[in-house]
Every structure is written in C-alpha cells, then in structure tokens.
C-alpha cells in the first residue's frame, strides 16, 4: 500500500486547512489509526490529532475544538482531518502516520502554508508645490505572508522606489513615488496597487494628486474699444487666472479709491454707466496659499464729443 | 498479555472530586490508546475518556469540562481525574487498554473500581 497525500497545502488565514492523508492499500488490509502530528524543528513531533479505528477521533487538548474529521461520508481508509481556522502559527510541517492491519504502518510529510492578505494603507506625501523638485508624492505600505508586490498604477510621470522588512512570520513592503510637480498633475490619480497570492484580485488605494500653483494673471474686457465711451453701460474688467488652492481676487485703482458705483464681484469689476472719471488705472490682485500675482490695466474713456481721443491698453504683470 | 490495575474510587458528595488511577504492565504496544469506561447498574458499559500515546483526548459529552484524562508513558499509567462529581456518575469504572492484534484491536480490562456520588 501507499498514502496519497499533497506536498504543500495552501490556506488563507482564517480558512479551514484540510490535511490529506489517503491509504491505497489491498481490498484486504485496513486502517487502525492515523495519528497526525506536528514536526516542529525546536519542538520536535508532537500529536496533534489521531483517528482511531475502534474509538474515533482523538484531539490534542492544546487543538481542542480545531480539529475535525471532513463531514461523511468518509471512506476508512481516509485519514484526512480539518484543522479550522487557519492562524499563521499552525504554518509548518505536518506528519500523517498510518498504522494498518496487517500491512505495518506507512508515514507521509506535508507542508502547511497560510497566506496573510495584507491590508495595504497609502500616505500622501508632503504638500505639492509646483516649481518644487522630485517630490514625494504618496508611499504606500502593505506587510503579508508571503511579502506582497505594492507597485503604483497612473498616468503620472514619476519614479517609484521600494524597500521590505522582514518579520518572524511576515514582510512588509513599502513603495514611494516621487514626482516633479508640476500642474498638469492636479486632479490626476495615483494608485497603489497590491498583489498577494491570498488576495483574489488585487487589492487599489487610489490617492488624487493636487498641485499647489498659481498662474500669472492678465486682465480682459478692454478689447472692444466702443464699449469705454461715456454713457456706455455694462463695461467690465474680467482678471483671468487660475491656481490650486483657487485663487482670491482683490481689485484696487493705483491712482486713488475705486469710483463710486464701480462693484468688485470676485474676479470682475463691473461699471456704472461710464464717465471720464472711470479713467485711471486699475490693478488685479491674485492670490493664494501659495502666491500672490498682479495686472494692471490703463482705463481710458472716450468721450465722444472729443474724437481725437483713443482707449490706451497697457497690460504688465 | 496486558494486565491493568485500577485505584482511586470510592464514596464521595455531589460536587466533589476523586482521581482514578489505571497502571498497566506487560506487552504494550508503541501505538496503544488507553482510557476509562463505566458501568452503572443495570446499564450498558458506556466509554467515559480515552487517551493517545501523544496526549490527544476523547471524551463522553456528558463528562466533558468535569473529567481529565492524562497519562504517563514512562509508567504506563492512565489517569482520571473527576471534578464536579453527580450522584448519576455512580458507576463502576474499568480502565481499558488497546492494543493492536492480528486484523484490528483488542481491548484489554482491568477489574473496575466502584466510584459513588452521594447526594
């Protein structure tokens, strides 16, 4: 005869390991008792179960409760048992010994392996400043049994870079990715990817990128030139930028207070129905967290009974 | 030939406690099981605990949390020990070895001890 039994028996921690130990033997010969143990280098063998024949199956008071026998039917001269709820100290090597009449007795090893999913968390980096250099931007840590892969998954160009530490019974792996910020990136998603051969698909941690930056400001609204004549209603100073955190707009007239009737409403300057008054020149004040820009713009208003006179635009930053 | 001999019963009160002892001597096998059966009066002999080589325990679920079965190999001792005794624990106690012969196994009995639980 012959046991038929697995090299390696692979769980998920937290599942039922199911530890085969199978006799092939003659029509005649049977199985008295299985006796499973634990083959522990330090420890030595020591039982962890036995299934006997005549008086059923005997428990290892330290597995009480753990191991059972796979539901019927069973054949008997099926030696296999379930050990439940797989934990990462049971990961080892296992010995089934077959004691049969009247063939003797027959011996197999096996392996254990439980598989620790990991539980991957991602840190963002350093606030992002565009103008800075390679940066942090998220590290991402994962530790399982067997050490899992982290790799990062965008459209982001940037480096990434890893390092492990190994436990008694686990590896943790960090990966960072550092990247030029820059503020195209805003907004971009960067995903931590982790693989583990107890995980069924892989398991993403998505972290959204965001750029601190401020772009230089410009001033519209004196293009058409028939809308700055006296009497004229509706005229307008639009100040155009654009920043992460978004930008505050502050509107001011360089040469005095702002006239009467004039409303700043966030980046717009609106006008009442204009005069030569409205003359002069106006500043555009951008700002964020990170900055702060401005553009200045000469007003002049036409008045029609003076043709001779023309809008002067000067824009400087 | 096994020969078993039984020590420890007696008369004791509801809730109490008594030790078993079972030694056996003779051609004991490398593989052999050994426990504790009862027998009360005019019932079937039911199986109380048996005991591995290795330490691993089975137990009667009307004794299990009260009964600990232990053994020493060097000695070829098996033990019971009895805690939180009932007056329907009453019983004769036959310790029982089990070797391999031929084909399956043999039971080998010692005499008994009478245990009685007075309520």
């Known amino acids: 005869g012959e046991l038929e039994t697995s090299d390696v028996v692979t769980v998920v921690l937290g599942q039922d390991a199911k530890l085969p130990c199978f006799y092939r033997g003659d029509p005649d010969e049977q199985v008295g008792q299985v006796a499973w143990a634990r083959v522990d280098p330090n420890e030595g063998i020591r039982e962890l179960a036995l299934l006997h024949s005549k008086y059923g199956l005997h428990v290892n008071p330290a597995y009480e409760d753990r191991v059972e026998q796979p539901p019927p039917p069973r054949d008997p001269l099926d030696g296999s048992v379930l050990l439940r709820n797989a934990v990462q100290a049971d990961e080892g090597e296992y010995e089934c010994r077959v004691s049969t009449f009247p063939a003797g007795s027959f011996q197999a090893r096996m392996r254990l392996r439980v598989l620790v999913p990991p539980l991957p968390s991602l840190n963002p980096g350093p606030p992002l400043e565009e103008g800075q250099g390679l940066t942090l931007a998220a590290s991402c840590t994962a530790e399982g049994s067997p050490a899992p892969s982290v790799t990062w998954d965008t459209e982001v160009k940037g480096t990434q870079s890893s390092r492990s530490f190994t436990h008694p019974r686990s590896a943790a792996v960090t990966s960072e990715f550092h990247l030029v910020p820059s503020r195209s990136m805003n907004g971009q998603p960067l995903t931590c990817v982790v693989s583990h051969p107890g995980l069924l698909q892989d398991r993403r941690i998505t972290h959204t990128l965001q750029v601190a930056f401020l772009a230089e400001a410009s001033v519209r609204g004196l293009e058409d030139q028939n809308l700055w004549q006296v009497g004229r209603e509706g005229a307008t100073l639009k100040c155009l930028s654009e920043g992460q955190p978004p930008p505050k707009y502050n509107w001011t007239r360089l040469d005095g207070p702002l006239p009467s009737g004039v409303r700043v409403k966030g980046d717009t300057l609106g006008f009442p129905p204009l005069t030569t008054e409205h003359s002069g020149v106006y500043v555009c004040h951008v700002s964020n967290e990170l900055s702060s820009r401005d553009s200045q713009v000469t007003v002049e208003v036409l008045d029609p009974e003076d043709p001779g006179k023309q809008v002067d635009l000067v824009s400087a930053s | 030939e096994v020969q078993l001999v039984e020590s420890g019963g007696g008369l004791v009160q509801a809730g109490g406690s008594l030790r078993l002892s079972c030694a056996a001597s003779?051609?004991?096998?490398?593989?052999?099981?050994m426990g504790w059966h009862r027998q009360a009066p005019g019932k079937q002999r039911e199986l109380v605990a048996t005991?591995?080589?290795?330490?691993?325990?089975n137990y009667a679920d009307s004794v299990k949390g009260r009964f600990t079965i232990s053994r020493d190999n060097g000695k070829n001792t098996v033990y019971l020990q009895m805690n939180s005794l009932k007056p329907e624990d009453t019983a004769a106690y036959y310790c029982v070895d089990v070797e391999p012969s031929g084909m399956g196994w043999r039971d080998y009995w010692g005499q008994g001890t009478q245990v009685t639980v007075s309520s």
């Open positions: 005991i591995t080589r290795g330490g691993s325990t």
């Open positions: 003779g051609s004991i096998s490398s593989i052999n099981l």
